[in-house]
Interface confidence: low
């Protein structure tokens, strides 16, 4: 997911203007003038703001990655949702990409959980009922679970 | 949900220094301007320090100027107060306050529970 | 004298209405300025109840029930809150708060406490 900055770039487009501020701050789904005078509003589809501020630009929306897909999209209020795709997770440690789920489980371990966007399988030993932590041998050519964040916006 | 837990209260002795955390979660703590406000036992709440959205602009009470400093670590979605050369008239419940905007203004719509700091010899 | 005065203390009956008061001291001009209303129950931290700047120009806190409402005397230079329908739980006390973007610093005013009468 590429995450802007709170100091978006300048650009030169027109924006429409809306209102004047309250107390110096904008209303959601706008930033404020160079002069403080006016709230300009973000432009829908391309930036946003989530709520009242005195922001001289609003922040720009979120584009999902490839292996995403737009579960919301950017409203002048509300920033782009982003999910991975079926089959694969976004892992707590590295949230940045998605990850591929476990095909199965390794043996003498059986599947409690399904693949989720925000969590890899979970297989618990057979005989115990503990969850499986450690490394998978190589050879069972899987990634080891951690527990996921569920989606949210990317901001 | 929105929730703010401060931390690092205690007893501590006149002229002596105390770190303040408030630990935030549930929102995006990098575009909300903070705050905390103190509360002595019996009385009103007093506003000790406000920090935007960024960490740019720090503003103090005069009663704690010189002596208390505001800091966040967007990071960590963390807000922190150093209080220095501790008096006790700085004896109070302290709280962490978020406001509504990016900004520092009167609309504190979200609290933590409070922690208290005991100046005592 | 303080920036904001509040009463100290005022009771009203079960399912009544009253009127807290809040005023700014005269070398200031209420027009320029929103009202804020805090309530701090007993043990609790503060919570936001409302924001009052004109009919046209105001909010109410999360969970913040419309009984609770805001108002503005410009000539008496006071904000008011509105508790309507006044119930047990409401017994706490109310601070209020004013300011503009241009001043930074914050001051509360020194709270009213509110008994409900049964």
């Known amino acids: 997911i590429t995450r802007q900055s709170l100091d978006p770039q300048r650009r030169a487009a027109p924006q429409q203007k809306r209102s004047s501020p309250t107390e110096g701050l904008c209303p959601p789904g706008h930033h404020i003038s160079e002069d403080s005078r006016e709230c300009i509003s973000c432009k829908y589809g391309q930036d946003y703001s989530t709520h009242w501020n005195d922001f001289l630009f609003c922040l720009r929306c979120t584009k999902c990655d490839s292996g995403e897909v737009e579960v919301n999209s950017c409203t002048t209020t509300r920033n782009t949702v982003c999910q991975c795709e079926e089959g694969t997770f976004r892992e707590e440690d590295s949230p940045e990409i998605c990850r591929k789920c476990r095909t199965g489980c390794p043996r003498g371990m059986v599947k409690v959980k399904d693949c989720t966007p925000w969590s890899d399988i979970e297989c618990v030993h057979k005989e115990s009922g503990t969850k499986h932590t450690g490394e998978v041998p190589a050879v069972e050519k899987t990634v080891t679970t951690s527990p996921g964040t569920p989606a949210s916006p990317c901001s | 949900e929105v929730q703010l837990v401060e931390s690092g209260g205690g007893l501590v002795k006149p002229g002596g220094s105390l770190r303040l955390s408030c630990a935030a979660s549930?929102?995006?703590?990098?575009?909300?301007?903070m705050h905390w406000v103190r509360q002595a036992p019996g009385k009103g709440l007093e506003w000790v320090a406000g920090i935007n959205y960024s960490g740019n602009n720090k503003y103090y009470a005069d009663s704690v100027k010189g002596r208390f400093t505001i800091s966040r670590d967007n990071a960590k979605n963390s807000l922190y107060l150093q209080m220095n050369s501790l008096r006790a008239e700085d004896t109070a419940v302290y709280y962490c306050?978020?406001?509504?905007?990016?900004?520092?203004?009167?609309?504190?719509?979200?609290w933590g529970q409070g922690t208290l700091v005991t100046v005592s010899s | 004298q303080p920036v904001l005065h509040q009463p100290p203390a005022m009771s009203s009956a079960l399912g009544t209405t009253i009127r807290l008061t809040c005023t700014l001291r005269?070398?200031?001009?209420?027009?320029?300025?929103?009202v804020y209303w805090y309530q701090q129950r007993p043990g609790h931290p503060p919570r936001f109840l409302l924001r009052y700047f004109s009919q046209s120009d105001k909010s109410q806190g999360p969970q913040v029930p419309p009984r609770f409402s805001g108002s503005k005397d410009v000539a008496r230079n006071r904000g008011y809150l509105s508790i309507s329908e006044l119930q047990p739980e409401d017994e706490a006390m109310y601070y209020c708060a004013m300011g503009a973007r241009s001043s930074v610093t914050h001051v509360f005013g020194s709270g009213t406490q509110l008994t409900v009468l049964s």
């Open positions: 005269n070398d200031h001009d209420i027009g320029v300025y929103s």
């Open positions: 306050a978020r406001d509504h905007s990016t900004w520092l203004s009167r609309h504190l719509d979200y």
């Open positions: 549930g929102f995006t703590f990098s575009t909300y301007g």
